[in-house]
């Protein structure tokens, strides 16, 4: 889609954004009993030179940022991605209509960084 | 800069791309003795619906992809980021001109995924 940001200089630095996800909005309400939704959050923003300490950048991201600066046609900027994720417990119906309580890993973004 | 992808439907899926980085090109040749460069690689490509098994997507990325589909103006697609990184050993001069051998973590991209 052409819904990418067109003027990245107007974008804020990579950070966590709050996002509440309703399972009804996802169309999952028929199999997920509880919760009704959860604070999933998401990561977004620029990973531009220079990468500061808040950006939890890896050594590779630092190198990639420099390569991108000099060769933007070939190598993209590092991307803003989750660095810490939490699990949530979900009560749902399985295929046999049994009620199951299961912990789903990596569902909630707790922190973001440049990778 | 407006270097976002304009026609994402033509972009390949998230994957590892090969990239050799010369320390001279980075301007680091005066303090790094060896190696002269290394295969850093990088991640690039689309994290579009549906995310397949090759994309090493987290549960959060799967949820975010669905939210993006329904709200592309508000929530971006997950991004293509390293999932496995390797270290390299570097021989360099420290600030006191001592020769140091140090292992630098997270320098080489071994695998990519949607996060």
């Amino acid at each position: 889609s052409a819904s990418d940001y067109n003027s990245s200089e107007l974008k804020t630095a990579c950070r966590k954004h709050e996002l509440y996800v309703s399972f009804q909005d996802l169309g999952w309400q028929d199999w997920i009993i509880a919760p009704k939704g959860y604070a999933a959050n998401y990561c977004d923003g620029e990973c531009s030179f220079p990468l500061n300490a808040h950006m939890n950048a890896t050594n590779h991201a630092i190198v990639q940022t420099l390569v991108h600066l000099m060769n933007p046609e070939y190598v993209p900027k590092p991307c803003c991605a989750p660095t810490k994720l939490n699990a949530i417990s979900v009560l749902y119906f399985d295929d046999n209509s049994n009620v199951i309580l299961k912990k789903y890993r990596n569902m909630v973004v707790r922190a973001c960084g440049c990778h | 800069s407006a270097s976002d992808y304009n026609s994402s439907e033509l972009k390949t899926a998230c994957r590892k791309h090969e990239l050799y980085v010369s320390f001279q090109d980075l301007g680091w040749q005066d303090w790094i003795i060896a190696p002269k460069g290394y295969a850093a690689n990088y991640c690039d490509g689309e994290c579009s619906f549906p995310l397949n098994a090759h994309m090493n997507a987290t549960n959060h990325a799967i949820v975010q992809t669905l939210v993006h589909l329904m709200n592309p103006e508000y929530v971006p697609k997950p991004c293509c980021a390293p999932t496995k990184l390797n270290a390299i050993s570097v021989l360099y001069f420290d600030d006191n001109s001592n020769v140091i051998l140090k292992k630098y973590r997270n320098m080489v991209v071994r695998a990519c995924g949607c996060h």
């Epitope: 046609e73 070939y74 | 800069s1 026609s7 033509l10 010369s22 301007g27």
Partner: antibody
Framework: QVHLVQSGAEVKNPGASVKVSCKAS????????IHWLRQAPGQRLEWMGW????????DYSQKFQGRVTISRDTSATTAYMELSSLRSEDTAVYYC???????????WGQGTLVTVSS | EIVLTQSPGTLSLSPGEGATLSCRAS???????LAWYQQKPGQAPRLLIF???SRATAIPDRFVGSGSGTDFTLTITGLEPEDFAVYHC?????????FGQGTKVEIK
């Protein structure tokens, strides 16, 4: 050997658009970025933007943002530069040029003269 | 944006003489990512020097690039008739790629 061959000269009215083509041969088209530059009479060379034909990624100079569109046709190994809302100051020779990773522009098209006049 | 200023604007010399062209950058050019091009009337620029001092393929050794940081020089030792042209310097260390205004080397 590497060749970049551009389309012929154009005369346009103010407010019109022009689309210049750049046919590449002698190398793998999708492996190298194509840049567009221009040179107005008595002016320095001016960078306009680029396209990576392999992934269709583009970037434009802020000066031309919103007026320039760079595209490509891989089957024809051709890059295109379209400039809209032409004004007399856009009268210039327009060049395509190839750039490799870490290097400057190593091969250039022969240039296309675009004259904007009413 | 890095602004490049070339001097002199015009250099009037005879064949066999040496030419010294200067290019000054408004800020330090990282890793000496500076190139020199030759341009003859009605033709596209031709790459001569990259990395401030490396000659491009098939460029004669009478063309010598030097300098670092903000000050760069193109020296042509023993001008040949085909060397009379306009010379441009360019920084290629990332966007936006910028050029100097050019130095014209003309026959005296």
């Amino acid at each position: 050997q590497v060749h970049l061959v551009q389309s012929g000269a154009e005369v346009k009215n103010p407010g019109a658009s022009v689309k210049v083509s750049c046919k590449a041969s002698g190398y793998t088209f999708t492996t190298f970025a194509i840049h567009w530059l221009r040179q107005a009479p008595g002016q320095r060379l001016e960078w306009m933007g680029w396209i990576n034909p392999g992934n269709v990624k583009t970037d434009y100079s802020q000066k031309f943002q919103g007026r320039v569109t760079i595209s490509r046709d891989t089957s024809a190994t051709t890059a295109y530069m379209e400039l809209s809302s032409l004004r007399s100051e856009d009268t210039a020779v327009y060049y395509c040029a190839r750039r490799q990773l870490w290097l400057p522009f190593d091969y250039w098209g022969q240039g296309t003269l675009v004259t904007v006049s009413s | 944006e890095i602004v490049l200023t070339q001097s002199p604007g015009t250099l009037s010399l005879s064949p066999g003489e040496g030419a010294t062209l200067s290019c000054r950058a408004s800020q330090s050019i990282s890793n000496n990512f500076l190139a020199w091009y030759q341009q003859k009337p009605g033709q596209a620029p031709r790459l001569l020097i990259f990395g401030a001092s490396s000659r491009a393929t098939a460029i004669p050794d009478r063309f010598v690039g030097s300098g670092s940081g903000t000050d760069f020089t193109l020296t042509i030792t023993g001008l040949e008739p085909e060397d009379f042209a306009v010379y441009h310097c360019q920084h290629y260390g990332g966007s936006p790629w910028t050029f100097g205004q050019g130095t014209k080397v003309e026959i005296k």
